[in-house]
Amino acid sequence: GELETSDVVTVVLGQDAKLPCFYRGDSGEQVGQVAWARVDAGEGAQELALLHSKYGLHVSPAYEGRVEQPPPPRNPLDGSVLLRNAVQADEGEYECRVSTFPAGSFQARLRLRVLVPPLPSLNPGPALEEGQGLTLAASCTAEGSPAPSVTWDTEVKGTTSSRSFKHSRSAAVTSEFHLVPSRSMNGQPLTCVVSHPGLLQDQRITHILHVSFLAEASVRGLEDQNLWHIGREGAMLKCLSEGQPPPSYNWTRLDGPLPSGVRVDGDTLGFPPLTTEHSGIYVCHVSNEFSSRDSQVTVDVLDPQEDSGKQVDLVSAS
């Protein structure tokens, strides 16, 4: 007769490993006992279990509660055992020794390989700012056995680069995603996708992109200069910009302090009933942590008793 086994058995971390050992004997041959041992654990063999045809299964103390026989029906020539809840430390070499009658003893070895699913981590790169060149947006690292696959899922245009480092039978994979930051990328998801034979489904980690920028400032409210006349109520100037982080606004008057009664409400400058005192050059200052912008306008309050309207100049400066 001969022993049938596998030279390598693969199991996912936490699952049960079947260690096969089947005696294919001639008619009338019987298996008396099967002894299982781990044989790569340093000095000598470490007993796992003894499977006796008459007395059943005896598990050594080190493996108490972890070694069982496969569920029935059982073939009396089958010396296979189940190793419950495989851990990485179980990875190694095992031997079954089969005592048969009348053919004598046989032995076979197998190697148990434990697949270790990765626990990926995503690390954002440095702060992204519009105007930068190709910049690291994020890196994603996953270590497992065997090597995980790390890819990216995103609508954002960019380039990826990967590097891998191998341990014995496991590997750490790092993938980097580089892009040229633009404001259109703000709020866009960048997802690291990790695949591995030990995972039922891909693992995904999503990072939301934040790109610092500040748009040019402009002032709205002077489109119809004829509305800016003495006595008009509800006149206002509104400063237009956008940015990330959201910008703050400040209003000043270039040719003196803001006239009394003029209200500053964030991006809006509200005027009381207009007088000629409100004529002047107004500056909107827009700033965030990334940059600052200015836009200035000239307000000329018209006297309806005068025939000719006045020109209104809009000047933007950065």
Epitope: V8, P146, A171, P197
Partner: antibody, heavy 115, light 113 residues
């Protein structure tokens, strides 16, 4: 019997290419990471490349971009495609199986790069 | 990259005497998650491929005589042949398989005095 047999070595001019093969038998090839290691005459061992069970590949800086390791599990075969060969690549090339360290080695195939 | 340095480069020992080879790695090869040192020792005889003797710094490969033993942790390792036999004449290499690029020591030649 567990065995690795290399082939494909020979004489090649600088700048030329060569493809080495390693035939595996006696074990479940697809379950093992595999390596190429080289040894110049009278010199020590130098690790050349590795490939994992899922096809992940690894190289030292000395051969990166010039050498490509691959495997064909259905044929129990390991390959090393060597391009832009240099005199310094002259060596005996061994394929090896990794378990804890490299536990099985082939007998090696000789690559000579010379004009 | 991890650099492996062996000492001495060569060693002459009388039959039956102890031979000791040292190997130093430029950084630790101890993997904290399983407390194993990813270091192997190989024996290479003339005209033959290397043969794995020791892995995890101190675990003997199956079939290797017990006169061969390995010790050490972190960055400093030792291969000891407790009683040198004629068939032990060879070059011995240490190798780290902690991370790629895997690297070997330059080798130590053991001869009989």
């Amino acid at each position: 019997e567990v065995q690795l047999v290399e082939s494909g070595g020979g004489l090649v001019q600088p700048g030329g290419s060569l493809r080495l093969s390693c035939a595996a038998s006696g074990f479940t090839f697809s379950s093992y990471d595999m390596h190429w290691v080289r040894q110049a005459t009278g010199k020590g061992l130098e690790w050349v490349s590795a490939i994992g069970t899922v096809g992940d590949t690894y190289y030292p800086g000395s051969v990166k971009g010039r050498f490509t390791i691959s495997r064909e599990n259905a044929k129990n075969s390991l390959y090393l495609q060597m391009n832009s060969l240099r005199a310094g690549d002259t060596a005996v090339y061994y394929c090896a199986r990794e378990w804890n360290g490299m536990d099985v080695w082939g007998q090696g195939t000789t690559v000579t790069v010379s004009s | 990259d991890i650099v492996m340095t062996q000492s001495p480069d060569s060693l002459a020992v009388s039959l039956g005497e102890r031979a000791t080879i040292n190997c130093k790695s430029s950084q630790s090869v101890l993997y904290n998650s399983n407390n194993k040192n990813y270091l192997a020792w190989y024996q290479q005889k003339p005209g033959q491929p290397p043969k794995l003797l020791i892995y995890w710094a101190s675990t003997r490969e199956s079939g290797v005589p017990d006169r061969f033993s390995g010790s050490g942790s972190g960055t400093d390792f030792t291969l000891t042949i407790s009683s040198l036999q004629a068939e032990d004449v060879a070059v011995y290499y240490c190798q780290q398989f902690y991370t790629t690029p895997y690297s070997f020591g330059q080798g130590t030649k053991v001869e009989i005095k």
